[in-house]
Every structure is written in C-alpha cells, then in structure tokens.
C-alpha cells in the first residue's frame, strides 16, 4: 500500500522535512503533490511527468519544495503555515489513480526564556514571590530548576498558569537560590539565565564574642557582635543602657573594675525594619597578688620530720593549686592537702621530696604561679662504701682507700685501723705497705646536722702469698632451661689473674658460658643438668698461685617423662602385678598412680597381688618435682587374660 512517512514528524521552523514515499507503484505516468487531505487543483504544489522528466509547479508551490524521482517531497525553510496534511496523487500508466496522505507539525525554535518576578526583595516569613517564565509560547512545556535541580516537593512551592508561573509562599532565607526556567517543545528546549532570589531576613538574635565574661583589671575589652541578616545588620552598643557607638565592634582599652556591667548589642535591618538585641554581663576583677610559698621546716630530716607548705596570701573564694616537679600532685599517702587546698603537708619526708614545689591561685581568668621552692631534706649518712674493693695487697705497694656515704649535708669522714683513729679525711693513703699494715680498716661517716653516724669495716691483708680463693654463687639451686648462674672468684686482689676449670678441664667453648669482671666472674646461661659439674677457680700473680675448693653446681631439672617397668602389658589371671615408675629428676620426684583415672597410692612401686580380668585398664604414673614446679605422666594399658 502506498504510504507517506514524514521525516521528521515534528519540524522546527526554518528546518526541512522530507515526505518519504513508500511502496510507490511501478509503470507510472506521473504524480502530483497537494496541500491538504484531498486532491484539489487549487492546492497543487508540484506535478511530475515521468515521460518528459519535468516538474510542473502548481498554485501552492512556494519554491521551497523539491520533488525527487522516487516521488518523495522535500520542503525546505519550513514556516508555521506548512503544518498539516500533504496528499500524493499517483497516476499509473493504465490511468488508474492512487492516493496517500502524510502530515507533519511545525513548531517554532524556542527563544531563550527569561524569568520575571513580582517581588525582587521579598521579606522572610512574610512575602510570597511569583516567578513567571517569559515569553508565553503556544504548545510549549515549562519546567523549573532550583540550583540546577528539579523542584523539591514543598507545600510552599506552587506551579500555576500551565507551569509557567512558580510561586514561593512565605519565603525563607533558604529560598535564596538560583532559579531557572526551561521551555520545551517537540523541536527545541531552552533554559533561561539564573535568577538569584534575594530574600530579606533578620536580624536574628545577635551573638557577642568572645563568650568570655570575666576580665582582669588592665586588660583590653574587645567585643564583636554578629547577627544573621540580609542586608547586613547595622549595629549599636549600649553599656548599662547608655548608647556608646554604632559599630560592629566595641573596644575599651585598659579596663578597670568600673567597666563591669551589662553590655547590649542591638542589630537593625533597615530593609525589614526589625531590631534584635543581646545582653552580656561583663565582670572586671582587680589583679590578685602573686602567690608565694612558706614552709614550717626549712631543713627537715629524712624519715623523721613532716613539712607543711602553705600558699600565701589567703584570699577568700579562691582556688589553690599545687605542682611538684612541674606536674600536678601525685597520689601518695604521704601527701596531704588542707580543706581549702592552701596547705600541702609532706609526712615523713624523704630525700626524693626536694621538689621544686609551686602553688597557684586560680581566678576567673587565669592561674597565677608562685616562684618554685626547693626543700632541703637532711638525710644520711648511708652506709659508707670503701673503694677500691681489693682486700689483698702485695708488700711494697701504696694503699689508697677512699670512703663515700650519701648524706645531706655532706658527711665528715674518719679512718680507724684496728680501732685506732688515724685521720679525719675522706681518703686514707699509706705508702710502701708491709705485712704489718694488714688489719681492720674502718671508715666512719658523720652527718653533723642529723647527728647520725655510720661505719664500714674492710679487712686488708698484706702478703706476698695469695690466699686460697673461694667461689661464691648467685643461685645455689638453678632450674634447668630457665635460670642463669654467676660464679665469682673471691677475693678481689690487685694485679691478679683469674682462671677457671670445669671437672679438672679448662673452660669449654660454649655460647652459654661467659667470663666477665676481669675473668673473675663466670656466668652460665640457661643451665642444663649437664652443667652439674665441679667448678674450680684459681688466682695467680707474679709470685704465687692458688686454687679454690671445687663447687658442684646443683641443677634442678625434671621430672622427665616417666618409664614404667616391666614393659609387659599382658598378664595372666592370678599373677602379681608389680609396676615400678621412674623419672629423671632433681630433686627426686614424688610419684602417684591412677588406675582408670582413679587415684591409688603415692609410691614409686605399684603392687597388686593375684590380678584378675577386673584389673584390666589404664595405669597412669604421675611424677611431680616440687623444686622445679614441673609435672609429667605416662599411661600404660594392662590386659589380664583368664
């Protein structure tokens, strides 16, 4: 069937449309196009005779039409009047006619729209605004955009006039946005430029900053006021109800107590005609004096005296604070604060309580610190130490001993030999000593402030022959795979070489053996049961040598996994069952048995006479070493056959 297709169906003014013919019959004489839905000679656009290949314009021909050889009609530079139906009349060679009608619609290319408003400065919560999209265009669809988004759902937004008018009721400051309208028809879509809605609002209740209401005498007062407002608010300041100035900021330098009072900021919006005020009460305090610390005992004695530190001056309604070593007070039962925190008491002072101590007075604005105070704690003397630690010397050398004891004030020292006072010095020097200088050397330290004295006695032996050494140990019963043991060869002697033997052999190379302290100390790390050997140390110098008695290391170990003997697990009924349990352990372990999980006896040997099949089951031996704190066990299944 002959049909006409319009491409496109919706045509923009000024563009072109092709009336495309489908199923054109063959053997044609010619064809003709007409404006309208029927063949009307007065509305003929153009005819085409195939034989002459000539197009003949009709009364409705505008010069904008082209008829193609396939009978399709192109209409150019489309105008609004071209809208409607077009009929193709086909004359076949047998002079039989055929007709088909097509149509298209013409729409204008829309102009760029613009937005008109009935109120350029609406007031918040009072006015409504109606935006209208211009121009009014027939067959156009109107759309609205707020901040480039489609309209939000809101009871305050209403579309009318075929969506051409957007009304905002009771505008708010949040309606301050970019508004655009868009016009659409089937052939074009255009958006307007943005219109920014300028909503007048405020002023809101002003805020005064800073929020601080307490000041010190002599400071500057600088208050700033701000209120949300469009247009921006005009500000006025009042102090105690009296107008001061029309500025957003109020500045008063070097304030005094007389500047205390109520400070009011008034914000005014000239467009909305509204005023809002906020009041803040400012208090100016006189400058407090700098605090200082007094003490009831300037030279307390360690472990005897208490000290009370008081923060001066006493001021009513004041908070007192304390710091020790630049830190807040530690929690300690020896530190006590009075009810008002003004007095800090140190009970039974120690040498570590020297400080420094600071107190502070807190007012509304800041904390004033005192100067630091250091306590002079009297202590000591502690037991004096005599150095060097050598106790054996060779004749002919010089003996130089020094004594020191911790003490405040510093100790006074005295030396005694065999109970006889020698000199009141910290050091004792005797040149070219002989065997006669052997004896008891006593250092006495005395604290004149506390009246306390302490002594230390050292035995000095002057001999060409070295004494027989001995071995001291820091751990007489080390646990295997856990403890270390340090052997030290005594005594410490000047210009002496120290040697070690294990089981009569020189020390083996081992990462677990380490010599230190001039070879005088031998350390065994992570001892094992194999380290339970005889250890001997030796000392020698240019004139003599000597060895200690052996010391056998007693290594605690085990219990290892026990062994139950005999190994048999099958017995005949009526036989005696005699099981013995053994576990390597030092010291020997405690043994216990369980049969089928039931405790039996605490012996190394389990004996059951004349067993029966009732004695079938699991026999467990448990071993425990109380010294190592370790346990072990083994289970054996016994079968008794009838």
């Amino acid at each position: 069937k002959l049909t006409i297709e319009s491409t496109p169906f919706n045509v923009a003014e000024g563009k072109e449309v092709l009336l495309l013919v489908h199923n054109l019959p063959q053997h044609l004489f010619g064809y003709s196009w007409y404006k309208g839905e029927r063949v009307d000679g007065n509305r003929q656009i153009i005819g085409y005779v195939i034989g002459t290949q000539q197009a003949t314009p009709g009364p409705a021909y505008s010069g904008r039409e082209i008829i193609y050889p396939n009978a399709s009609l192109l209409i150019q530079n489309i105008i609004q009047n071209d809208t409607g139906f077009y009929t193709l009349h086909v004359i076949k060679s047998d002079l039989v006619n055929e007709e088909a009608t097509g149509q298209f619609r013409v729409y204008p290319e829309l102009p760029k729209p613009s937005i008109s408003s009935n109120n350029s400065k609406p007031v918040e919560d009072k006015d409504a605004v109606a935006f209208t999209c211009e121009p009014e265009t027939q067959d156009a669809t109107y759309l609205w955009w707020v901040n480039n988004q489609s309209l939000p759902v809101s009871p305050r937004l209403q579309l009318s006039n075929g969506n051409r008018t957007l009304t905002l009721f009771n505008v708010t400051r949040n309606d301050t946005a970019s508004y655009k309208c868009e016009t659409q028809n089937p052939v074009s879509a255009r958006r307007s430029d943005s219109v920014i809605l300028n909503v007048l609002y405020g002023p809101d209740a002003p805020t005064i900053s800073p929020l601080n209401t307490s000041y010190r005498s002599g400071e500057n007062l600088n208050l700033s006021c701000h209120a949300a407002s469009n247009p921006p608010a005009q500000y006025s300041w009042f102090v105690n109800g009296t107008f001061q100035q029309s500025t957003q900021e109020l500045f008063i330098p070097n304030i005094t107590v007389n500047n205390s009072g109520s400070y009011t900021c008034q914000a005014h919006n000239s467009d909305t005609g509204l005023n809002r005020t906020t009041v803040t009460t400012i208090t100016v305090y006189a400058e407090p004096p700098k605090p200082f610390i007094t003490s009831n005992n300037s030279n307390p004695v360690e472990d005897e005296d208490a000290v009370a530190l008081t923060c001066e001056p006493e001021i009513q309604n004041t908070t007192y604070l304390w710091w020790v070593n630049n830190q807040s007070l530690p929690v300690s039962p020896r530190l006590q604060l009075s009810n008002d925190n003004r007095t800090l008491t140190l009970l039974s002072v120690t040498r570590n309580d020297v400080g420094p101590y600071e107190c502070g007075i807190q007012n509304e604005l800041s904390v004033d610190h005192s100067d630091p105070v250091i306590l002079n704690v009297l202590y000591g003397p502690d037991d004096p130490t005599i150095s060097p630690s050598y106790t054996y010397y060779r004749p002919g050398v010089n003996l130089s001993l020094s004594c020191h004891a911790a003490s405040n004030p510093p100790a006074q020292y005295s030396w005694l030999i065999d109970g006889n006072i020698q000199q009141h010095t910290q050091e004792l020097f005797i040149s070219n000593i002989t065997e006669k200088n052997s004896g008891l050397y006593t250092c006495q330290a005395n604290n004149s402030a506390s009246g306390h004295s302490r002594t230390t006695v050292k035995t000095i032996t002057v001999s060409a022959e070295l004494p027989k050494p001995s071995i001291s140990s820091n751990n007489s019963k080390p646990v295997e795979d856990k403890d270390a043991v340090a052997f030290t060869c005594e005594p410490e002697a000047q210009n002496t070489t120290y040697l070690w033997w294990v089981n009569g052999q020189s020390l083996p190379v081992s990462p677990r053996l380490q010599l230190s302290n001039g070879n005088r100390t031998l350390t065994l790390f992570n001892v094992t049961r194999n380290d339970a050997r005889a250890y001997v140390c030796g000392i020698q110098n240019s004139v003599s040598a000597n060895r200690s008695d052996p010391v056998t290391l007693d290594v605690l170990y085990g219990p290892d996994t026990p062994i139950i003997s005999p190994p048999d697990s099958s017995y005949l009924s009526g036989a005696n069952l005699n099981l013995s349990c053994h576990s390597a352990s030092n010291p020997s372990p405690q043994y216990s048995w369980r049969i089928n999980g039931i405790p039996q006896q605490h012996t190394q040997v389990l004996f059951i006479a004349k067993i029966t099949p009732n004695n079938n089951g699991t026999y467990a031996c448990f071993v425990s070493n109380l010294a190592t704190g370790r346990n072990n066990s083994i289970v054996k299944s016994i079968t008794v056959s009838a």
Partner: antibody, heavy 115, light 107 residues
C-alpha cells in the same frame, strides 16, 4: 516544439534600467517555470531568478534589490527588469524553462553596458 | 547560498580517453545536481539531472554519479564533438547556483 527567444536593447548606458523579454512557444507559462541566467564574456553561468507557474518569484540574493521578474501568461512572455546597470552587467542573458534544472534554453541576447 | 566548486578550469584529453569532471558542493545537496554542456557560441544543454539521470537524447558515454557534497561527470570515451565547457548546478536550495565551469580541450 518548445522554443524560448530573448529580445533586448543590446546597448545600455551605465545607471540606466534594463528590460528583456522572453517569448515562449510550444508550452504554456501556466505549466512551466521560467529562469533567467546570464553569462559575462569568457565567464561562467550566473542564475538571476525564477518565476513560478503561479507568478511567485525567487531571486539571486546578490542582485535581489535590482531585479524584477514578471510575466504575461496570455502573451506567453516573461520580463526581466534590472535597475542601475553597471559595466559589469555586460553579459549574454538567457531565459530557460524548468523548476529545478533547465532543460530548454533560448539562444540568449547580448547586453553591453557602456557609455 | 550553496557554493559549487569545479576545481579544474581546464582539462586536456585525447579522443577515446575516459575523463572525469568533478564538482564539490559547500553542503549536502541530496543528489539535486544537474550537469550542462556549452559548446562555443551555443546555449547550455542539460546532460544529467538528479546527479545520474541522463536527459533525453544524451549519448550513453555521459554518466553522472555522486552523493552528499561530491559529484562527478564522466565521459567514457571522449569524442571530438565533446570539446565544450561543462557546468554543474545545484537545485537543492534557492537560489540555484552553478559551478565555475571546466573547459574540456582535445589534445
């Protein structure tokens, strides 16, 4: 037999007006559109305008203000009028039939614009 | 206005040769193109219309082709009487416009 014949003044002074007539035979002006085409000496063809069967016209946009095409269907005559001639209007002027392409042409008439 | 450009003002050929004359439109003219032959001292004569349809009485050695903006007139075997000026013309839009012409010369 389709025939078209142009007749004109031959020589015209500058700034004068031109009138050329195209007389057709063998067909009716109610069925055929007539175009005017000119060809300056040694140059190419330039389309001047068209008169449709119903009397509507279209013109070369460059010459539109100086051109006018009309016709008398009963006399089978089409008229080309041109104002304010200049020397560069010197050309051979043809009338030709056809809505789109021009299948019948006259022999043309030569116009010289000179003082 | 649509501009029709014939890039070759002159083309030289020999009798029996195949020659192609080209024409380029400044926009798509949807095959609404005609070709004319004008011999010295004569009026133009239409050869081809609708880009490829031969007019009545035109020898079949003349063929037209093309679409969109590019069109070609081809003479498959040039004869001595084919010495002439050849013009293209678009009728897609009013005003109708011609190309500048291509003169075919016989060597």
């Amino acid at each position: 037999q389709v025939q078209l014949k142009e007749s004109g003044p031959g020589l015209v002074a500058p700034s004068q007006n031109l009138s050329i007539t195209c007389t057709v035979s063998g067909f009716s002006l109610t069925s055929y559109a007539i175009n005017w085409v000119r060809q300056p000496p040694g140059k190419g063809l330039e389309w001047l305008g068209i008169i449709w069967t119903g009397g509507g016209t279209n013109y070369n946009s460059a010459l539109k203000s100086r051109l006018s095409i009309s016709k008398d269907n009963s006399k089978s005559q089409v008229f080309l009028k041109m104002n304010s001639l200049q020397t560069d209007d010197t050309a051979r002027y043809y009338c030709a039939s056809g809505v789109y392409y021009f299948d019948y042409w006259g022999l043309g008439t030569t116009l010289t614009v000179s003082s | 206005d649509i501009v029709m450009t014939q890039s070759h003002k002159f083309m030289s050929t020999s009798v029996g040769d195949r020659v192609s004359i080209t024409c380029k439109a400044s926009q798509d003219v949807t095959t609404a193109v005609a070709w004319y032959q004008q011999k010295p001292g004569q009026s133009p004569k239409v050869l081809i219309f609708w880009a490829s349809t031969r007019h009545t009485g035109v020898p079949d050695r003349f063929t037209g082709s093309g679409s969109g903006t590019d069109y070609t007139l081809t003479i498959s075997s040039v004869q001595a009487e084919d010495l002439a000026l050849y013009y293209c013309q678009q009728y897609y839009r009013t005003p109708r416009t011609f190309g500048g012409g291509t003169k075919l010369e016989i060597k």
